[in-house]
Amino acid sequence: VPRWRQQWSGPGTTKRFPETVLARCVKYTEIHPEMRHVDCQSVWDAFKGAFISKHPCNITEEDYQPLMKLGTQTVPCNKILLWSRIKDLAHQFTQVQRDMFTLEDTLLGYLADDLTWCGEFNTSKINYQSCPDWRKDCSNNPVSVFWKTVSRRFAEAACDVVHVMLNGSRSKIFDKNSTFGSVEVHNLQPEKVQTLEAWVIHGGREDSRDLCQDPTIKELESIISKRNIQFSCKNIYRPDKFLQCVKNPEDSSCTSEI
């Protein structure tokens, strides 16, 4: 690595990043007829334009606007599932319950899921060596700003009852510093959203505590109530059984505690 290249604390751009984004775009638009009109080369150009030749600590939401415009997508606003620190189960769920949607079920979320990227000021190079870490380096980095932008837009689009899956195994079941806690909660629109419904996912087999009474959940309830949105909470004691009941709701075990 040349000595002049900035060394950041986070991992570098995911290898084959341009090819991955382009391939994901093509795959997504093939599977989702409503997005067949999207030109994936234009999408990649807009994505690249958001961070290439820019200082990776000086990225703004404005940088991503061309990409946001190209990726505009209408998701049924009453079928949105948010999640925090429990991505895998949320995605397993929407794979079964096909009429509910996480951010990663949309084109833009699908393109960027699990990827890292950044560029360098004044060069057209992608930095595969290192990228800024949100804590150790800077918050206005390409990845963080992207997720903040798409998460805000996703939350703003929600209506009626919005569901959120939370990880009951974490010390902070609701974390104010997560994307959900810092972005999505504050961008739900009270004139459109009646209720935020939290599903608290238990980890332990024998964990029968009511995690809806957890202090961090009460904090979430307080934040939501102050925004004139109702709040409800449900314990999911057995996530495996929960998924089974989503697949087969006629199963008699689904009438007991899940």
Epitope: F93, Q97, D99, S232, C254
Partner: nanobody
Framework: EVQLEESGGGLVQAGGSLRLSCAAS????????MGWFRQAPGKEREFVAA????????YYMDSVKGRFTVSRDNAKNTVYLQMNSLKPEDTAVYYC??????????????????WGQGTQVTVSS
């Protein structure tokens, strides 16, 4: 499985009221959104009202808004449909149905896993 049983139907004059009940035998309804549907002779079954599992959110077809109220008592495993200002066009067999909670409340009957046998409501003019 969930056994749903409707009651409270009958013959009533236009402008009158009825309260339908839907009870689940031996099973909890707290994992289910509950819907009311109706079917008039020679017509398709149609959505009337629904209430989500927690009871916080209710939904109505336009023609019954302001006249019908859906509610639930999870402790009693019962869902209610209070029908006021009844009209002859409300005449139908009324069914209650249960939809697993992990989805948006449905107006589409296909989303409901369990159904009652129905109760007849007749509104005379």
């Amino acid at each position: 499985e969930v056994q749903l049983e409707e009651s409270g139907g009958g013959l009533v004059q236009a402008g009158g009221s009825l309260r339908l009940s839907c009870a689940a035998s031996g099973r909890t309804l707290s994992n289910y959104h509950m819907g009311w549907f109706r079917q008039a002779p020679g017509k398709e079954r149609e959505f009337v009202a629904a209430i989500n599992w927690s009871g916080l959110n209710t939904y109505y077809m336009d023609s019954v808004k302001g006249r019908f109220t859906v509610s639930r008592d999870n402790a009693k495993n019962t869902v209610y449909l209070q029908m006021n200002s009844l009209k002859p066009e409300d005449t139908a067999v009324y069914y209650c149905a249960a939809q697993f909670f992990a989805a948006a409340v449905g107006r589409d009957s296909a989303k409901y896993a369990y159904w009652g046998q129905g109760t007849q409501v007749t509104v005379s003019s």
